[in-house]
């Protein structure tokens, strides 16, 4: 690829790079839906070392429209020059390219979480992977939003060290016999558009009851 020549390919694909469960996932959609590939191959190189395009092993001849690049793309400053090839059988239908910089292009998907409601508090259990690479921390902060009767409260728990392992946060001083909904998301220091989790709701038991309520999924 010559970076200073006219663009390598057309723009028949839309790419998105996301941090999903602290893994770098590249996904794509085709703009022209009349083209239906049977499989894809993803290749990339680094702009600073313009070597031959390298096939991503777990994304060669794949039928999926996403690829896990966690072990391939580590630098937030490098330009990753990406080429996606779409095939039908042995015929190449298209190839499209895009340059990514993780620090600019990464979006952050919300972590998995569960809630358990008690009389006057909710336990929010956020699931992080057991180990998270330093370069995938991205200056992220966890935000837990509590909603009840149209009022939204933001909680920003302080997480000691990096975001790894499970984390429990208690939303306290709640009103018994009231419905509460909780959403969890990761906020970037740059406040790029956040992706909030779907709400999980629970009706807290009335005051005299002490057993936990089932959280509505």
């Amino acid at each position: 690829i010559s970076y200073d020549s006219p663009d390598y390919t057309d723009e028949s694909c839309t790419f998105k790079i996301s941090l999903r469960n602290f893994r770098s996932i590249l996904s794509w959609e085709l703009k022209n839906h009349s083209i239906v590939p049977t499989h894809y191959t993803l290749l990339y190189t680094i702009m600073s070392k313009p070597e031959d395009l390298k096939v991503v092993k777990n994304c060669a001849n794949t039928t999926r429209s996403f690829c896990d690049l966690t072990d391939e793309w580590r630098s937030t400053h490098e330009a990753y020059v990406t080429v996606l090839e779409g095939f039908s059988g042995n015929t190449t239908l298209f190839s499209c390219s895009h340059n990514f910089w993780l620090a600019i292009d990464m979006s952050f998907e919300p972590p998995e979480f569960e809630i358990v409601g008690f009389t006057n508090h909710i336990n929010v259990m956020v699931k992080f992977p057991s180990i998270v690479e330093e370069e995938l921390q991205f200056d992220l902060s966890l935000v837990i939003e509590e909603q009840s009767e149209g009022i939204v409260k933001k909680h920003k728990p302080e997480i000691k060290g990096n975001m790894s392992g499970n984390f429990t946060y208690i939303i306290d001083k709640l009103i018994p016999n009231t419905n509460y909904c909780v959403s969890v998301y990761l906020e970037h220091s740059d406040e790029q558009a956040v992706i909030k989790s779907p709400l999980k709701c629970t009706l807290l038991p009335p005051g005299q009851e002490s057993e936990s309520a089932e959280s509505a999924k």
Partner: antibody
């Protein structure tokens, strides 16, 4: 050769907005980031933000959020910076710059656009 | 935000003599990818900035080899082995490791 041609100087009224352009030539526009930098008269340089023209994704200096909006038009190989609710503090020369192979390394700079805010 | 402190503020040098500019950072500029995104530029009077050095010590093409960049962590230096008349202007260091990028206050090089 790589060139970044910026729009002409602007004299604008307070509380209005202005859009500065930066036309790129000599390279594939969508394959490199465009950065924007502010320089007030006789002062140093301040980073405003960066855009990936290929994706339209941006990152801003917190200080310029709500003040500057970065966009890019791939068809004309032009990056834009809109400055809103202008005050005398916005009077400055604004530079666009292309990032090299790495983010944050600005290898080529435009000639600058002077914006003067005055009633 | 990272603060970059440049010294001296002004440098008066005789043509043919060496010059040295220091740039100290309030925090390490070593990125998790092992690179240090510390760069130097020159802004000649009435002109736009021109990058001289990137990644601490890599010289831009067309920049004379009398310019050298060095340093690591928080302490960086730009040296000119023999100053020439075309070198006058304001020199800035800037860091691209941490957002927001920040610039040093500048060092004005004058010819004696």
């Amino acid at each position: 050769q790589v060139q970044l041609q910026q729009s002409e100087a602007e004299l604008v009224r307070p509380e209005t907005s202005v859009k500065v352009s930066c036309k790129a030539s000599g390279y594939s526009f969508r394959n490199y980031l465009i950065e924007w930098v502010k320089q007030r008269p006789g002062q140093g340089l301040e980073w405003i933000g960066v855009i990936n023209p290929g994706s339209g994704n941006t990152k801003y200096n917190e200080k310029f959020k709500g003040k500057a909006t970065l966009t890019a038009d791939k068809s004309s190989s032009t990056a834009y910076m809109q400055l809103s609710s202008l005050t005398s503090d916005d009077s400055a020369v604004y530079f666009c710059a292309r990032d090299g192979y790495y983010l944050g390394t600005m290898d080529y700079w435009g000639q600058g656009t002077s914006v003067t805010v005055s009633s | 935000d990272i603060v970059l402190t440049q010294t001296p503020l002004t440098l008066s040098v005789t043509i043919g003599q060496p010059a040295s500019i220091s740039c100290k950072s309030s925090q390490s500029l070593l990125d998790s990818d092992g690179k240090t995104y510390l760069n130097w530029l020159l802004q000649r009077p009435g002109q736009s900035p021109k990058r001289l050095i990137y990644l601490v010590s890599k010289l831009d093409s067309g920049v004379p080899d009398r310019f050298t960049g060095s340093g690591s962590g928080t302490d960086f230096t730009l040296k000119i082995s023999r100053v020439e008349a075309e070198d006058l202007g304001v020199y800035y260091c800037w860091q691209g490791t941490h957002f927001p990028y920040t610039f040093g206050g500048g060092t004005k090089l004058e010819i004696k």
